[in-house]
Interface confidence: low
């Protein structure tokens, strides 16, 4: 969470001087209440936008954009302060909307806009647009917030900004699966076009249950550049257990732009008697980096074994 | 070199709050999930907490959740663990360690110590 | 949560002996495992991941072995240098708990 870097921050319109500024999150007005306090902003609308640094890189951008109210409160307003918590840490950043004149009432409704906040993918974010002067205590709140889901890097828009694509967005393995005789699995998938190696993890699961009667782990070493976007094919041998019939796959690659943090993709197999897939099953979370939900794992003994080459 | 380098350790109070810091080095800090393990006088090793590389999953053991706060800023190289509400137990040394790609932690700090003691 | 436990305790052998130390998991924990050893006065150092993977630098007379529940480091050949703490510990999920140690010294 951060501003982008090398914009001008605006907000001088016509009939209004304006400046951003940095904030703290905490107005003086909360130490300093005032008498007279303007009303809250009438509507909050956010989307996400892809702007570039002055590195020239794609970034996700929050565009929040508000209306004021048509009262005689806009004549005690001040300015606002803009506040984004990233929900999962609670990290918050605020800049300050600072009037260097007074509002007016005009033929259209004031509006602001402000598309500097830099956001991650598949984050979720609470933005606030609190006037100011701040309310004193007790008084009327004169804020609005609203939740925004930021999409993950599947996310046709998101793809192609560059956290998406240095976590190994545009790497599609197009992943196959295929049950064979004798308790094995045929994994195939497509390299990406860099020598660094990769992990199968595989997962069985009874039918309809999301308790695993079986794992494994295999590394496939890095492939040679004559190799780069070839199929990779692995024979995964699977725990003889009756019942332990659904399998997801999940391939880690290791690319050197997010190392132990690249995207990963899954391929599940269903029970034979299951024509889909029941429900989205819990990610392996080894230590590197977890990705999604957990759930317990029964006690067993992981005995698979496997093999892999690369197919030409 | 990569390097890992505790500080913030010191004498606390029980009840007392201590903020402990990790600054890397040598390494693309940003791309890797990072952990706090203590080891108490004469004890064993005792994971903390685990951040994952862009903080968006977040592990504490037990026996510190609701009192520790793991943080990271990757525009600095630095981890975090903010301890509030300390208790004797809570003495050790403390170290940050990065995962090693493949598996466990293949690089250490040499440890900072925290002393909780009235 | 699952348990790690490491047998023995502690251990005394002469230089050149073979030693085995076990560690067990409470539960399956496929072969999301490492082996760390620390010396006195020192932070700990990681000999193998991945249950049987030896660690770049690391002496090859250590060796692991395991899936599952049941683990085991080896030293082919004790040397004086090898005196210290060694630990276990999973990986596949949090809490990643690790095995309470297990003091090697030489005879």
């Known amino acids: 969470l951060r501003l982008l870097d090398h914009r001008a921050l605006v907000c001088s319109q016509p009939g209004l001087n304006c400046t951003v500024k940095n904030s703290t999150c905490l107005d003086d007005s909360w130490i300093h209440p005032r008498n007279l306090t303007p009303s809250s902003p009438k509507n909050i609308y956010i989307n996400l936008s892809v702007s570039s640094t002055q590195h020239g890189e794609l970034v996700p951008v929050l565009h929040v954009e508000w209306t004021l109210q048509t009262d005689a409160s806009i004549l005690y307003l001040e300015g606002a302060e803009l506040s984004v918590l990233q929900l999962n840490t609670n990290e918050r950043l605020c800049v300050r909307f600072e009037f260097l004149s007074k509002l007016r009432h005009h033929h259209r409704r004031w509006r602001f806009t402000f598309s500097h906040f830099v956001v991650d993918p598949d984050q979720e974010y609470e933005v606030t647009v609190h006037h100011l002067p701040k309310p004193i205590p007790d008084g009327d709140p004169n804020h609005q917030s609203k939740n925004f889901l930021v999409p993950d890097c599947e996310h046709a828009r998101m793809k192609v900004t560059t956290p998406c694509m240095s976590s190994g967005s545009l790497w599609d393995p197009n992943i196959t699966v295929e049950t064979l005789e004798a308790h094995q699995l045929r994994v195939s998938f497509t390299l990406w076009n860099e020598s660094t190696h990769y992990q199968i993890l595989l997962t069985s699961f009874p039918h309809m249950e999301n308790h695993s009667c079986f794992e494994h782990m295999h590394h496939i070493p890095a492939p040679r550049p004559e190799e780069f976007h070839q199929r990779s094919n692995v024979t995964l041998t699977l725990r003889n257990l009756k019942g332990c019939c659904r399998h997801q796959v999940q391939i880690q690659p290791f690319f050197s732009s997010c190392l132990n943090d690249c995207l990963r993709h899954s391929a599940t197999v269903s029970c034979p008697e299951m024509p889909d897939t029941p429900e989205p099953i819990p990610d392996y979370m080894p230590l590197w980096e977890p990705r999604s939900g957990s759930s317990d794992y029964k006690d067993d003994d992981d005995k698979g074994s496997s093999h892999h080459h690369h197919h030409h | 070199e990569v390097q890992l380098v505790e500080s913030g350790g010191g004498l606390v109070q029980p009840g007392g709050s201590l903020r402990l810091s990790c600054a890397a080095s040598?390494?693309?800090?940003?791309?890797?999930?990072m952990n706090w393990v203590r080891q108490a006088p004469g004890k064993g090793l005792e994971w903390v907490s685990f951040i994952s590389a862009r903080s968006s999953t977040i592990y504490y053991a037990d026996s510190v959740k609701g009192r520790f706060t793991i943080s990271r800023d990757n525009a600095k190289n630095s981890l975090y663990l903010q301890m509030n509400s300390l208790r004797d137990e809570d003495t050790a040394v403390y170290y940050c360690?990065?995962?090693?790609?493949?598996?466990?932690?293949?690089?250490w700090g040499q440890g900072t110590t925290v002393t909780v003691s009235s | 949560d699952i348990q790690m436990t490491q047998s023995p305790s502690s251990l005394s052998a002469s230089v050149g002996d073979r030693v085995t130390i076990t560690c067990r998991a409470s539960?399956?924990?496929?072969?999301?495992l490492a082996w760390y050893q620390q010396k006195p006065g020192k932070f700990p150092e990681l000999l193998i991941y991945a249950a049987s993977t030896l660690q770049s630098g690391v002496p090859s007379r250590f060796s692991g072995s395991g899936s599952g529940t049941d683990f085991t480091l080896t030293i082919s050949s004790l040397q004086p240098e090898d005196v210290a703490t060694y630990y276990c510990q999973k990986y596949n999920r949090a809490p990643f708990t690790f095995g309470p140690g297990t003091k090697v010294d030489i005879k």
């Open positions: 040598g390494f693309t800090f940003s791309s890797y999930s």
């Open positions: 360690a990065r995962p090693k790609v493949g598996g466990g932690m293949d690089v």
């Open positions: 539960q399956g924990i496929s072969n999301y």
